[in-house]
Interface confidence: low
């Protein structure tokens, strides 16, 4: 399902993961950044509007278009896009055009991800961003390096924000000991925008306090506690955004009533059988990866929705029931 | 299943006009360039026209100039080539291709059409 | 513009492997990493084959693989099959207007 974006002067189609993210701009100055340098001589200018928007997964387009002073300018020219900050951020992309050639060697394309759509012999350095991530949401800045009889260059000074939203995706669920021999359960999410939080599990209503973390790189992480795990059974951490859901849960099981000895028993011959099990998978994928020369084709990310993780905790104490967390 | 099916060829006198239509499906139109390519009877292929995703850049061949348009309405999937003052040269088995990227003037073209056949002859 | 230079036929038998070669100049095969191969049965739409020098498209038999050197460009065909018998064409984006140019096209003929 389409889903328009209307940002200012650019218009931006997000698609299903896939497909090309297209981005129109209306060139009228007053709707774009448009960066004019002039002096007697020369007249330089870039237009990129103030933001782009994608989901991740997608792929998105940062449109720069320039004029210049020298009109019919055919030499050697360089393309460069830069992100965090002009003049000095690091270069994600860049290309080289000879003299008289309108495609631009590209150079430098960061994880293999930027590719120039536009074509800077006609004053069009605009840059396709594939599988967009959380982390690529931040600012960047076009450039331009003529090098032949003409030594010239420009660049972008306020840039284009690329604002990737996201659907959430639990990132870590975890069940804690608390200091008066309880447990807390903890659930961590990214989104954009931030995800709500709500824990839901026996004898809860749904728990909508969510904490949110500070930024940690440039993920959009969030955080929910259930300070106290009264019950046993299925606690299941919710994550939404206007983009979507995602849930994972923890099961806490703890032993009531039984002796010091008869508990030990138990949880050794629990670990004793996940041990087995363990062993069993192991051995299974050595007996696979018997061939020496196994092709393993790149497999396509896992969808986010209906993420379950399953935390498994074992608490020792002499004067608190054990418990623990076990797979279905 | 991706496709192309091309429509419109025929026995044409010289000066004439014909319009060449190629309806696509299968795939997402509006993300990748098009193009027309053309076959003369027994020779090599060689490329007429391209157009970019959303038509804003559009590229002929010299020897058709001026005289073809290509077009694309993206609403209904579909890609045109309005060929007017034909000439006998121009006769030719016509495909349509799809390109690998939103922009014309890159090279592959990975899906093409049956082929239509243009006869220009008095 | 002039034409990409390919030989007008190669054969081979059964099993062996054959090269085409595609030459062009300084201004489309040897400036840019943009060549491509077609193959082209009699009577049948072209299918591409190679793809920016050397990348297959999915589908393609890894049989055929793609190369460059200077302004020439090469289709190596190995394990030649019955069905590898077809018209070959190459491509290349040139800095030239317009910007593309084909090849001659190679007859490849399986004895």
């Known amino acids: 399902m389409e889903k328009s974006i209307w940002l200012l002067a650019c218009l931006a189609w997000v698609l299903p993961t896939g497909s090309f993210v297209r981005t129109k701009i209306d060139t009228t100055e007053n709707l774009l950044n448009t960066e004019v340098h002039s002096s007697p001589a020369q007249r330089w200018s870039m237009q990129v509007p103030p933001e782009v928007s994608a989901e991740a997964g997608d792929a998105a387009v940062l449109p720069c278009t320039f004029t210049h002073p020298h009109r019919h300018y055919d030499g050697p020219l360089t393309a460069i896009w830069r992100a965090g900050e002009p003049y000095a951020g690091p270069q994600v992309f860049r290309c080289a055009a000879a003299r008289g050639s309108e495609l631009c060697q590209t150079a430098l394309s960061l994880h293999g991800r930027f590719r120039l759509l536009g074509n800077p012999r006609r004053n069009d350095l605009s840059l396709r961003v594939e599988r967009l991530a959380l982390a690529d949401d931040r600012r960047y800045f076009c450039r331009v390096e003529f090098a032949g009889d003409v030594h010239d260059r420009y660049e972008s000074r306020h840039g284009v924000r690329l604002h990737v939203t996201a659907a959430p995706r639990i990132v870590n669920i975890s069940v804690l000991p608390s200091p008066a021999h309880a447990f807390r359960a903890l659930c961590t999410a990214e989104g954009e925008p931030p995800p709500a939080l709500a824990w839901s599990g026996p004898a809860l209503g749904n728990s909508l306090a969510a904490v949110r973390s500070p930024r940690e790189g440039h993920g959009h992480l969030v955080t929910a506690e259930l300070p106290a795990l009264t019950h046993d059974g299925r606690y299941t951490c919710t994550a939404a955004n206007s983009l979507g859901r995602s849930e994972a849960s923890v099961y806490l099981f703890r032993f009531h009533g039984a002796s010091g000895a008869s508990t030990v028993a138990l949880l050794l011959g629990a670990l004793g059988f996940k041990a087995l099990l363990l062993l069993g998978v192991l051995a299974a994928r050595a007996a696979r990866r018997r061939p020496e020369h196994l092709d393993t084709p790149d497999t396509p990310p896992r969808s986010q929705a209906q993420e379950s993780n399953y935390e498994n905790l074992s608490q020792m104490n002499p004067r608190s029931p054990p418990a623990t967390m076990c797979s279905p | 299943q991706v496709q192309l099916v091309q429509s419109g060829g025929g026995l044409v006198q010289p000066g004439r006009s014909l319009r060449l239509s190629c309806a696509a499906s299968?795939?997402?139109?509006?993300?990748?360039?098009m193009h027309w390519v053309r076959q003369a009877p027994g020779k090599g292929l060689e490329w007429v026209s391209g157009?970019?995703?959303?038509?804003?850049?559009?590229g002929y061949a010299d020897s058709v100039k001026g005289r073809f348009t290509i077009s694309r309405d993206n609403a209904k999937n579909s890609l045109y080539l309005q060929m007017n003052s034909l000439r006998a040269e121009d006769t030719a088995l016509y495909y349509c291709?799809?390109?690998?990227?939103?922009?014309?003037?890159?090279?592959?073209?990975?899906?093409w059409g049956q082929g239509t056949m243009v006869t220009v002859s008095s | 513009q002039s034409a990409l230079t390919q030989p007008a036929s190669v054969s081979g038998s059964p099993g062996q492997s054959i090269t085409l070669s595609c030459t062009g100049t300084?201004?489309?095969?040897?400036?840019?990493?943009?060549v491509s191969w077609y193959q082209q049965h009699p009577g049948t739409a072209p299918k591409l084959m190679i793809y920016e020098v050397s990348n297959r498209p999915s589908g393609v038999s890894d049989r055929f693989s793609g190369s460059k050197s200077g302004n020439t460009a090469s289709l190596t065909i190995s394990g030649l099959q019955a069905e590898d018998e077809a018209d070959y064409y190459c491509?290349?984006?040139?800095?030239?207007?317009?910007?593309?140019?084909f090849g001659t096209g190679t007859k490849v003929t399986v004895l």
């Open positions: 291709a799809k390109g690998l990227w939103p922009s014309y003037d890159l090279d592959a073209f990975d899906i």
């Open positions: 300084s201004s489309d095969v040897g400036a840019y990493n943009f």
């Open positions: 491509s290349s984006y040139t800095s030239t207007i317009p910007p593309f140019v």
């Open positions: 157009i970019s995703w959303n038509s804003g850049s559009i």
């Open positions: 299968g795939f997402t139109f509006d993300d990748y360039a």
